[in-house]
């Protein structure tokens, strides 16, 4: 029950996280005009990964897309790439985790397969979250660098007669959305990995085998078999006592998970 809850919660948290990463990637407010200690302007600038916008006091907002690839800063391209990789990995992770959910029955899928899928999706969520956090952090670092550079050159002029105020940009809402979303995806991924450990079928060390001897059936107790070594070992159990003559109906039944005699 706890495993199912952990897996389900991990899935939901990751889903929210990935939705947040997508939202952050699409948002225009990655950087917003710094209003602190600046002349109050009737025009407000903000920028995203895909376009820059200007909101006037008149209420009109004008957005212009970055219609160039080569002309864009390498850092911006890197941030775009990180966010897209995060989204793609997260989306694949979600798809895989849907089939891995314990509460969903798909054919005769083994628990071991579900465990593997849970682990795979968990790792994907972790990487997705890290990509988002990395992308947002790179952009934030870029902003901080540019902020202090523009502060140093804030007032430039011709012989000190005319002042040209340089627009400074600070953290936009998308950065915080991205950090939180990346964190949630990461947490969801960790939860999936934890759930995977509980889902993995622990093979019993001693397996019972029903053995039919001639004349009457004798059930041999597990003591008559060598213990398999190690977790999940494929070592075949060797029979060390062969009692009685075999008849045509003699059957050695290999135990299923629930077949303990």
């Amino acid at each position: 029950m706890a495993v199912t809850a952990c897996q389900g919660l991990g899935f939901v948290v990751s889903l929210i996280g990935i939705a947040g990463i997508i939202a952050a990637t699409c948002m225009d407010q990655w950087s917003t005009q710094d209003l602190y200690n600046n002349p109050v302007t009737a025009v407000f600038n903000y920028q995203g990964l895909w376009r820059s916008c200007v909101r006037e006091s008149s209420g009109f907002t004008e957005c212009r897309g970055y219609f160039t690839l080569l002309g864009l800063p390498a850092m911006l391209q890197a941030v775009r790439a990180l966010m897209i990789v995060g989204i793609v990995l997260g989306a694949i992770g979600l798809l895989v985790s849907i089939f891995a959910l314990k509460c969903i029955r798909i054919g005769s899928m083994e628990d071991s397969a579900k465990a593997n899928m849970t682990l795979t999706s968990g790792i994907m969520f972790i990487v997705s979250g890290l990509c988002a956090i990395a992308g947002v952090s790179v952009f934030a670092n870029m902003l901080v660098t540019n902020f202090w550079m523009s502060t140093a050159n804030m007032y430039t002029g011709m012989g000190g007669m005319v002042q040209t105020v340089q627009t400074r940009y600070t953290f936009g809402a998308a950065l915080f959305v991205g950090w939180v979303a990346g964190g949630l995806t990461l947490i969801g991924g960790v939860m999936m990995c934890i759930a995977c450990r509980g889902l993995a079928p622990e093979e019993t060390n001693y397996k019972a085998v029903s053995y039919h001897a001639s004349g009457h059936s004798v059930a041999y107790k597990p003591g008559g078999f060598k213990a398999s070594t190690g977790f999940g070992s494929n070592t075949k159990n060797k029979k060390i006592y062969d009692g009685g003559a075999r008849t045509e109906d003699e059957v050695q039944s290999y135990p299923s998970k629930h077949d303990y005699v």
Epitope: P39, V43, Q47, S58, F60, V162
Partner: antibody
Framework: QIQLVQSGSELKKPGASVKVSCKAS????????INWVRQAPGQGLEWMGW????????TYAEGFTGRFVLSWDTSVSTAYLQISSLKAEDTAVYFC???????????WGQGTLVTVSS | DIVMTQSPDSLAVSLGERATINCKSS????????????LAWYQQKPGQPPKLLIY???TRESGVPDRFSGSGSGTDFTLTISSLQAEDVAVYYC?????????FGGGTKVEIK
């Protein structure tokens, strides 16, 4: 078409109050800000402040805080400029103007002359 | 506050001649976000409210004759009347729409010589 119609001229005594109205028509009142501009006799234009009827935001120029109050009534698509404790130097023509795309004043009221005299 | 300085204070031009009015702002009116200059030009005739001629420094308002043109960027702007007509006699104001408080120039009176 877009129209801003202002109330008529006012003659007031010093210390009194006046309320100038600016009725908007031909557009959605709450979508655009209304600015107020003062023009003293024989002088230039002086921006007083503006209101955004959509958001309720008001901004005043430095010399127009305290005695000057900008308000509006959405139900009648009207903006108001109220001046209290009138002084002789408040004698001027007061214009209202719509703030439009490009932060431009594209439509103006005809102006209201407020005369303060004892 | 941003100071808008207009020159000359008055201008007498012959009919059909070119009239040029200058406007200088104490700070740049160029917005880096959209590369637009937030400067407008208004015409005011006696007893009338101002009328918008030009916005964004060079964009002509609809219905304004094409003899009116605006130019300039940053801090220096110009309004040009390519061929002065009798009906152009008025006071012309420049106004910055970038910083609060919004401010107007002192005005330039255009007369016929």
């Amino acid at each position: 078409q877009i129209q801003l119609v202002q109330s008529g001229s006012e003659l007031k005594k010093p210390g009194a109050s006046v309320k100038v109205s600016c009725k908007a028509s031909g557009y959605t009142f709450t979508n655009y800000g209304i600015n107020w501009v003062r023009q003293a006799p024989g002088q230039g234009l002086e921006w007083m402040g503006w209101i955004n009827p959509g958001t309720g935001e008001t901004t005043y120029a430095e010399g127009f805080t305290g005695r000057f109050v900008l308000s509006w009534d959405t139900s009648v698509s009207t903006a108001y400029l109220q001046i209290s404790s009138l002084k002789a130097e408040d004698t001027a023509v007061y214009f209202c103007a719509r703030l439009y795309y490009g932060n431009r004043f594209d439509s103006w009221g005809q102006g209201t002359l407020v005369t303060v005299s004892s | 506050d941003i100071v808008m300085t207009q020159s000359p204070d008055s201008l007498a031009v012959s009919l059909g001649e070119r009239a040029t009015i200058n406007c200088k702002s104490s700070q740049s009116l160029l917005n880096s976000g959209n590369q637009r200059n937030y400067l407008a030009w208004y015409q005011q005739k006696p007893g009338q409210p101002p009328k918008l001629l030009i916005y964004w420094a060079s964009t002509r308002e609809s219905g304004v004759p094409d003899r009116f043109s605006g130019s300039g960027s940053g801090t220096d702007f110009t309004l040009t009347i390519s061929s002065l007509q009798a009906e152009d006699v008025a006071v012309y104001y420049c106004q910055q729409a970038y910083y609060y408080p919004l401010t107007f120039g002192g005005g330039t009176k255009v007369e016929i010589k």
